[in-house]
Interface confidence: low
């Protein structure tokens, strides 16, 4: 038996979805003009970084692409990146791959993703269309950190 990643359509409260632009993720209005990505989510088997108060330890990838979300510091600031990596390769690693790990927490019916490498930094979308998905410490009106996951086949 082998686990399989779960697939989700992801959107924020402003009806922004994630769209692949080259090897970057950007936020765009949910419309006929855009093809949103489907998010792959799988739980990390290694419990080294577990913190149930913060949520479940997960890896995040883009379905149909060998691309996974990871966090690294660029010019002193935690930054969200896409790396060529198969999510199942991450899952099969015995040791947790920290830069690729996120705490997935439920807030009501919405989901929040916090970087494990950079506690207090959350995946976010801005209110402006076409901006990259990014990491923020400032949760609120300008930076949307709550996402709705719709399960897809």
């Amino acid at each position: 038996w082998q686990a399989a990643p779960k697939s989700y359509a992801i959107r924020d409260s402003r009806q922004m979805v994630w769209v692949l632009s080259g090897n970057s993720l950007i936020a765009a209005p949910l419309s006929n003009r855009v093809k949103p990505v489907t998010l792959h989510l799988i739980t990390c088997r290694d419990t080294e970084f577990s913190d149930k108060k913060k949520g479940n330890l997960v890896y995040l990838g883009i379905r149909g692409k060998d691309l996974c979300l990871f966090c690294e510091e660029i010019q002193g600031k935690p930054t969200l990146q896409l790396k060529e990596k198969n999510i199942m390769d991450l899952y099969m690693e015995k040791k947790a791959q920290k830069p690729f790990l996120f705490f997935h927490n439920k807030e009501g019916s919405s989901s929040v993703f916090q970087s494990v490498s950079y506690p207090g930094w959350f995946i976010a979308t801005s209110s402006t269309s076409g901006q990259p998905i990014f990491l923020t410490q400032e949760r609120g009106i300008t930076n949307n950190t709550n996402f709705y996951l719709d399960s897809v086949e």
Epitope: A9, L30, K35, S129, Y148
Partner: antibody, heavy 122, light 111 residues
């Protein structure tokens, strides 16, 4: 064939809470491809979106009404409901419940109830 | 004042072509959000006429068509018939309001 039916009092006193229920028949309210909304139309005027709820229980409200509106779902009864508090005469309208379709994008409200007139008066 | 602007009324003779405009802004139609159109016959609930800017639900005659460009959208009705006399509403999503918005409605009169 999916049908929606609004029910609730036709007369509400000022400052009280308006409560309406929409019963869904011929389909399940828990389907992930749909969301459910309330829209109203004051006599002789245009349509105004009040709010929506989806199968996860996520709610979206018109900012101008947000402080007074609550939309909830009762999956066991295949119903969703609207509560609008502190009503005034300006809330007098025909209230419609509707189903919205979702598949990678929003596809509009494709099924509507026949509407119920709610009058706010003492 | 509606966020989406429609002409209050339009008219045409049977067989003619009429268009109804829906003008928004960079926070709704211009931001890329889809436009939907509804027909409301007198004394009845609205009916979805066009979804996703250009698509017709099954059962809607091909005399009805939708288009979108920039911050505006249009509904065109060709071969006008007496039964087309109704109110027509456009709808889109507005990111600054974080909600769905309707146009003020256009009354179509068939002369």
């Amino acid at each position: 064939q999916l049908q929606l039916q609004e029910s609730g009092p036709g007369l509400v006193k000022p400052s009280e809470t308006l409560s309406l229920t929409c019963t869904v028949s011929g389909g399940s309210i828990t389907s992930s491809n749909y969301y459910w909304g309330w829209i109203r139309q004051p006599p002789g005027k245009g349509l105004e979106w009040i709010g929506s709820i989806d199968y996860t229980g996520s709610t979206y409200y018109n900012p101008s009404l947000k402080s007074r509106v609550t939309i909830s779902v009762d999956t066991s009864k295949n119903q969703f409901s609207l509560k609008l508090s502190s009503v005034t005469a300006a809330d007098t309208a025909v209230y419609y419940c509707a189903r919205g379709k979702y598949y990678e994008t929003y596809l509009g409200f494709d099924v509507w109830g026949q509407g119920t007139l709610v009058t706010v008066s003492s | 004042q509606s966020v989406l602007t429609q002409p209050p009324s339009v008219s045409g003779a049977p067989g003619q072509r009429v268009t109804i405009s829906c003008t928004g802004s960079s926070s709704n139609i211009g931001a890329g959000y889809d436009v939907h159109w509804y027909q409301q016959l007198p004394g009845t609930a609205p009916k979805l006429l066009i979804y996703g800017n250009t698509n017709r639900p099954s059962g809607v005659p091909d005399r009805f068509s939708g288009s979108k460009s920039g911050t505006s959208a249009s509904l065109a009705i060709t071969g006008l018939q007496a039964e087309d006399e109704a109110d027509y509403y456009c709808q889109s999503y507005d990111i600054s309001l974080s909600g769905w918005v309707f146009g003020g409605g256009t009354k179509l009169t068939v002369l």
